[in-house]
């Protein structure tokens, strides 16, 4: 499919001008290559009319130009003094006319309306309101006032001052007669429809002395704004319909076949299932404007979108609307990253978030998508050191590996953590991405004690058991704080006896705190990583208390306080049932979502046969 995109249809009137914008992926080659506008012939060729290399056909001499905007990835063709001869099928494209890097554009130039003398022209957008003013003379002040619409050869009564309203206008038209001082009546038509367009005649009086005034009403269907976004990226539709609909339900819909427009999201709580987890309708301002953000763009999201206002929360005739034509560029600069990450209760996930590498200094954020009402995304963590209170000790945002990717680690997982999460920055808004965390059956891979109590002034040793599957990984201990997790020295104590069917490659790695102080209290993580790519983590809360008896403490899995729903096993390890435990300090064991091989190697994205890409999952 060609990545070039432009308007499918352009409509204008003789004597007017048009401006046609064509979009292309702004790669270095594309920015500098030839741009052209050509007219398609009956036999399939395409005759160049104008190009970025200076060529202008004699047909366009003095009335057209082509301007390239390489920084935006667009070029614009302006054509003036249009005639009906300009109607036809065109292409805007890059490179050679026949190469296929182009987009088909249909240009329709119509004859201007043949208007009667003294005709007032009203040009109004679909769904809006028009006021047709009708002057009259004093002698007709007391006489019947009426408005007719010319249908073919015959005028059809629309409204009159005796109370008649044509059924096509019921509930949306009124006739106002100004105060006695003003010799004027006006007809106000709301929620304009395309079918309202045409020639109208106002009349005061019914005899040969009646006053008449011609009006031509043009109802404009909104030209769609062209939106060109990358696959896997994000789009924001800003919808400003005006203060008159501030209190009316709003919607965004996507046009399907014919005139159907399927609701994508509305303010009445409806949301299309295909957009679950990746759409937000942001609250409207007093002026009735609102915006809709969609992330994780897919090929099938391309199409025409309309936003509007109607009490039903969906498109109806006469809804004021705004339109966009969304093109999803498959030659995306946004790298593939897993859209689904799996974890087990008590375990952990490490989520990779892409961002625009040109914006390494931008602030990174991670938020939890909430679908209630219009949807919102409460922040959980940011790269400036803010962590939501309920996530302290179990959530960290790391700038690693850098160069266009940051990492978010969430541990002590419970079923309540399942859901959609968004990665975003305060920079390029197109790089918002969505990941779904799923909680699956299984046991955490790393084994640590539950909550541990250290004694002031003594030494504390905390074990972390790594199964043999992590033999090639770097193992670490760190102390959590709201800006990250500061690495601490740890000792490899040799093979672990914590795993059945696990050979000498399993490891017991201990954290030692010498001469414990109050400052040592807090959350500690043990984990695995490969280079700057993080795998599973397990968390332990270390409390510090006054000295009771001398000595050092060497914590084994069995010695740590047993939490509710735990059984101390003969082997000296605790088994935690997969239940949501309110106090995060009560989690003893940890398990990462994905097989860390998937997370820690270069690719990390294992794509399943469905459309979603999944990260990891060895312990299914």
């Amino acid at each position: 499919k060609s990545p070039i995109f432009g308007p499918e249809e352009v409509n204008s009137v003789e004597g007017n001008s048009v401006s046609i914008t064509c979009y292309y992926p702004p790669t270095s080659v594309n920015r500098h290559t030839r741009k052209y506008w050509c007219r398609q012939g009956a036999r399939g060729g395409c005759i160049t009319l104008i190009s970025s290399e200076g060529y202008v056909s004699s047909k366009y001499a003095g009335r057209a130009n082509l301007t390239n905007f390489p920084e935006n990835g667009t070029f614009v063709v302006n054509i003036a003094q249009l005639s009906q001869d300009d109607s036809g099928r065109y292409k805007c494209g890059l490179g050679i006319n026949s190469r296929g890097l182009s987009f088909d554009v249909s240009l329709e130039v119509s004859q201007g309306p043949g208007l009667l003398n003294d005709t007032k022209v009203y040009t109004v957008d679909l769904g809006r309101t028009v006021t047709i003013n009708c002057p009259f003379k004093t002698e007709n002040a007391q006489k019947r006032k009426s408005l007719y619409k010319q249908i073919g050869l015959y005028p059809v009564l629309v409204i009159d001052s005796s109370g008649y309203v044509n059924p096509n206008y019921t509930g949306r038209i009124r006739l106002d007669i100004q105060g006695t001082g003003q010799l004027l009546f006006s007809v106000v038509i709301n929620q304009l429809r395309l079918s309202d367009a045409g020639q109208y005649l106002c009349q005061a009086g019914d005899d040969s002395n009646s006053n008449k005034k011609n009006a031509d009403l043009q109802v404009l269907k909104p030209e769609p704004e062209l939106v060109y976004e990358d696959l896997r990226g994000s789009v924001t539709f800003h919808c400003a319909l005006g203060p008159e609909v501030a209190n009316v339900a709003k919607f965004l819909c996507r046009q399907s076949s014919g005139e159907n427009c399927d609701v994508v999201v509305n303010t009445l709580g409806k949301r299309a299932p295909a957009f679950e987890g990746r759409i937000l309708l942001n609250p409207q301002d007093k002026d009735g404007s609102f915006s809709v953000v969609i992330t994780g763009l897919r090929k099938e999201d391309a199409g025409r979108y309309l936003c509007g206002a109607h009490s039903d929360g969906q498109l109806q005739e006469g809804s004021p609307i705004q339109a966009w034509q969304l093109f999803v560029n498959e030659e995306s600069t946004i790298p593939r990253s897993p859209t689904v990450v799996k974890g087990v209760a008590g375990g952990s996930v490490a989520v990779l978030c892409p961002y625009n590498r040109k914006e390494s200094k931008s602030i990174k954020y991670w938020c939890l998508w909430e679908g209630a009402q219009n949807g919102r995304c409460p922040l959980l963590v940011d790269s400036e050191g803010w962590v939501k209170a309920q996530y302290e000790g179990r959530l960290s945002l790391l700038e690693e590996p850098g160069n266009g990717t940051f990492t978010v680690i969430l541990n002590q997982l419970t079923s309540r953590d399942a859901g959609f999460y968004w990665c975003l920055t305060n920079g390029d808004t197109l790089w918002r991405t969505t990941v779904e965390i799923k909680i699956i059956e299984g046991e955490p891979n790393l084994k640590v004690p539950g909550n541990v109590t250290a004694v002031l002034g003594e030494t504390l040793k905390v074990p972390c058991h790594f199964p043999c599957k992590f033999s090639s990984y770097e193992k670490y201990w760190c102390k959590w704080n709201n800006t990250g997790c500061q690495a601490l020295p740890s000792q490899d104590e040799g093979p672990s006896k914590a795993f059945v069917n696990c050979d000498e490659n399993s490891r017991l790695v201990s954290l030692t705190l010498n001469l414990v102080t109050r400052a040592d209290e807090g959350w500690y993580w043990c984990g695995v990583k490969q280079g700057h790519f993080y795998g599973e983590t397990a968390a332990v809360y270390v409390a510090v208390e006054e000295r009771k008896a001398a000595g050092s403490r060497d914590v084994s899995l069995a010695k740590a306080d047993a939490a509710p729903d735990e059984k101390v096993l003969d082997s000296g390890f605790r088994e935690i049932e997969n239940k949501a435990i309110q106090d995060p300090r009560l989690f003893a064991e940890e398990k990462a979502v994905a097989d860390t091989r998937d997370q820690a190697d270069g690719s990390r994205a294992s794509v399943d046969s469905g459309s979603s890409e999944e990260q990891g999952g060895s312990s299914r």
């Epitope: 937000l280 942001n282 953000v293 919102r376 995304c377 922040l379 400036e384 050191g385 939501k388 209170a389």
Partner: nanobody
């Protein structure tokens, strides 16, 4: 429960200065932002300035830019609003507010983004 207490308001002549303080009792360690808002009689509450607790980034309403400065003192759990070159149209009750549950797409210039509010302090600028 977070309690916010504003102080420092009063009567001042046009062109003068005031420094408002917003002290938090029981501030959550995870306060995201603190904002100052004001409300003149018969008018809606309007945004004045806000400061991000981490990183210290600030934003101001156009009407006060260059005249007002927002700052914070972590140790004292206090946010300040230094108001210079005061004008009669700055007369209002000034409120401080704290956001501990920010939305990724929220606008910190909107009062609805903030959970905790102080009682307000009156600032009157005479001409």
């Amino acid at each position: 429960q977070v309690q916010l207490v504003e102080s420092g308001g009063g009567l001042v002549q046009a062109g003068g200065s005031l420094r408002l303080s917003c002290a938090a009792n029981g501030r959550a360690a995870n306060a995201y932002a603190v904002g100052w808002f004001r409300q003149a009689p018969g008018k809606e509450r309007e945004f004045v300035a806000h400061i991000r607790w981490n990183g210290g980034r600030t934003a101001y309403a156009d009407s006060v830019k260059g005249r007002f400065t927002i700052s914070r003192d972590d140790a004292k759990n206090t946010v300040y609003l230094q108001m210079d070159s005061l004008k009669p149209e700055d007369t209002a009750v000034y409120y401080c507010a704290e956001d501990t549950n920010p939305d990724a797409f929220g606008d910190l210039r909107l009062p609805s983004e903030y959970e905790y509010w102080g009682q307000g302090t009156q600032v009157t600028v005479s001409s």
